[in-house]
């Protein structure tokens, strides 16, 4: 959670001498409570903006946008904190506008702005717009929240900010999944423009349920220059269980900008359907009998086994 | 001392309701998001509910959505839990924790313990 | 939602040992992972934050690594009053899930 370093805020218009501050999120005015204090904000509005540092990075912001209440309160309204908490890191960042002069009339509705808030992808945030000075301990809250949740990576317009391409995300691989007989699955994706490794992760479930009963990771070498682009096809044996037939494949890359926490991507193989009515006995003994007691779950002795291929 | 200080814990038959209360001292509640977290007896912690300071983001874990309520009074310091339509699966020591500036959960209550039984 | 393993669920080792717990997550999480300590009967302890920063207070022996999927907590030689249940938790987004636990004991 940070600021904007460029260009420099500004909270002033037409009637309105104001400047922007840091903030400690601890305005005097909760240490010296007023008598008379400004009512809340009204109508705010938090939206996905996109902003350039002066490095020419783009990084998502939080533009932030309220009006005032038309009422007399405005005589007493000496300027804003704004607060941006993040949810899962607790963490606060505040700034306020200090107005230098003082409104003196509704001509127009007053409407205020600010989109120097940098967030991250996936993540969420408290907005809070504060009215100066604060209210007495017991006085009616004169402040107003809203949740605020940036999208992740795959939102498109997010997928070209600085953050985002940092982990990978113009890297769109194209898994293709498609089973193979004697218990095989062919991976085919498409290989970035980087000479850095990759593991395929492919784990195994029962039809309905979430815990496995197979795992299986896959390496695969860094590509020469003239594989980038190009599809890399593996073949991945699977375990021979009954029911284990619901099987996601992730591929892992290694950028030198994420390493070991790129953006993942993944492809699913669902069960096959069951047929509704039940099969016709068949007029011909079968060769073999179900193994009685057998282990549809995974023995660490027995492992799946793999290999693979560029192709040009 | 910054201190949590859970209450409202007992004993309560399925179907029933209760409502936990946590006290904060110590620290500027109204700057936290303040999170409750539970554990049955000899089994691990888990995530219950965040409410962020000003109330506006509010999660829940699946096992207790729709039934779990949580809420806070920045003017009392105060967090709180109502719990409706208690199972037995919701036995266990119920604990509110702060959490930390950069992540995880720094301050835990002493926690306290409901029974749902018949 | 994003499940959270713990490995072993339980080990012994002696006192001075090198003790390594694994956490594993089954999507990246970045580094929004922290540890915990619970000792019988007393309420969790956070030991780690940010994957690999040591809460202050909290012994030097206990170290936190990795980013993404795969973490680790380490206790370089351990002490008799690290006899607990370690938890690992994520908190990337909610909901903030805890590891299953891994319980640690002496020799």
């Known amino acids: 959670l940070r600021l904007l370093d460029f260009p420099a805020p500004v909270c002033a218009q037409e009637g309105l001498s104001c400047r922007v501050k840091n903030s400690t999120c601890l305005d005097d005015s909760w240490i010296h409570p007023r008598n008379l204090t400004p009512s809340s904000p009204k109508d705010l509005q938090i939206q996905l903006h996109f902003a350039h540092t002066q490095q020419g990075d783009l990084f998502p912001v939080a533009h932030i946008e309220w009006t005032l209440q038309t009422d007399a309160s405005i005589l007493y309204l000496e300027g804003a904190e704004l607060s941006v908490l993040q949810l899962n890191t607790n963490e606060r960042l505040c700034v306020r506008f200090e107005f230098l002069s003082k409104l003196r009339h509704h001509h127009r509705r007053w409407r205020f702005t600010f989109s120097h808030f940098v967030v991250d992808p996936d993540q969420e945030y408290e907005v809070t717009v504060h009215h100066l000075p604060k209210p007495i301990p017991d006085g009616d809250p004169n402040h107003q929240s809203k949740n605020f949740l940036v999208p992740d990576c795959e939102h498109a317009r997010m997928k070209v900010t600085t953050p985002c391409m940092s982990s990978g995300s113009l890297w769109d691989p194209n898994i293709t999944v498609e089973t193979l007989e004697a218990h095989q699955l062919r991976v085919s994706f498409t290989l970035w423009n980087e000479s850095t490794h990759y593991q395929i992760l492919l784990t195994s479930f029962p039809h309905m349920e979430n815990h496995s009963c197979f795992e299986h990771m896959h390496h695969i070498p860094a590509p020469r220059p003239e594989e980038f682009h190009q599809r890399s096809n593996v073949t991945l044996t699977l375990r021979n269980l009954k029911g284990c037939c619901r099987h996601q494949v992730q591929i892992q890359p290694f950028f030198s900008s994420c390493l070991n926490d790129c953006l993942r991507h993944s492809a699913t193989v669902s069960c096959p359907e069951m047929p509704d009515t039940p099969e016709p006995i068949p007029d011909y003994m079968p060769l073999w009998e179900p193994r009685s007691g057998s282990s549809d779950y995974k023995d660490d002795d027995d492992k799946g086994s793999s290999h693979h291929h560029h192709h040009h | 001392e910054v201190q949590l200080v859970e209450s409202g814990g007992g004993s309560v038959q399925p179907g029933g309701s209760l409502r936990l209360s946590c006290a904060a001292s110590?620290?500027?509640?109204?700057?936290?998001?303040m999170n409750w977290v539970r554990q049955a007896p000899g089994k691990g912690l888990e995530w219950v509910s965040i409410?962020?300071?000003?109330?506006?983001?509010?999660h829940y874990a699946d096992s207790v959505k729709g039934r779990f309520t949580i809420s806070r009074d920045n003017a009392k310091n105060s967090l709180y839990l109502q719990m409706n339509s208690l199972r037995d699966e919701d036995t266990a020591v119920y604990y509110c924790?702060?959490?930390?500036?950069?992540?995880?959960?720094?301050?835990w209550g002493q926690g306290t313990t409901v029974t749902v039984s018949s | 939602d994003i499940q959270m393993t713990q490995s072993p669920s339980s080990l012994s080792a002696s006192v001075g040992d090198r003790v390594t717990i694994t956490c594993r997550a089954s999507?990246?999480?970045?580094?929004?992972l922290a540890w915990y300590q619970q000792k019988p009967g007393k309420f969790p302890e956070l030991l780690i934050y940010?994957?690999?920063t040591l809460q202050s207070g909290v012994p030097s022996r206990f170290s936190g690594s990795g980013s993404g999927t795969d973490f680790t907590l380490t206790i370089s030689s351990l002490q008799p009053e690290d006899v607990a249940t370690y938890y690992c938790?994520?908190?990337?987004?909610?909901?903030?899930?805890f590891g299953p636990g891994t319980k640690v004991d002496i020799k």
């Open positions: 924790a702060r959490p930390k500036v950069g992540g995880g959960m720094d301050v």
């Open positions: 110590g620290f500027t509640f109204s700057s936290y998001s």
């Open positions: 409410i962020s300071s000003r109330s506006s983001i509010i």
């Open positions: 999507q990246g999480i970045s580094n929004y």
């Open positions: 940010a994957a690999s």
């Open positions: 938790q994520k908190y990337n987004r909610a909901p903030f899930t």
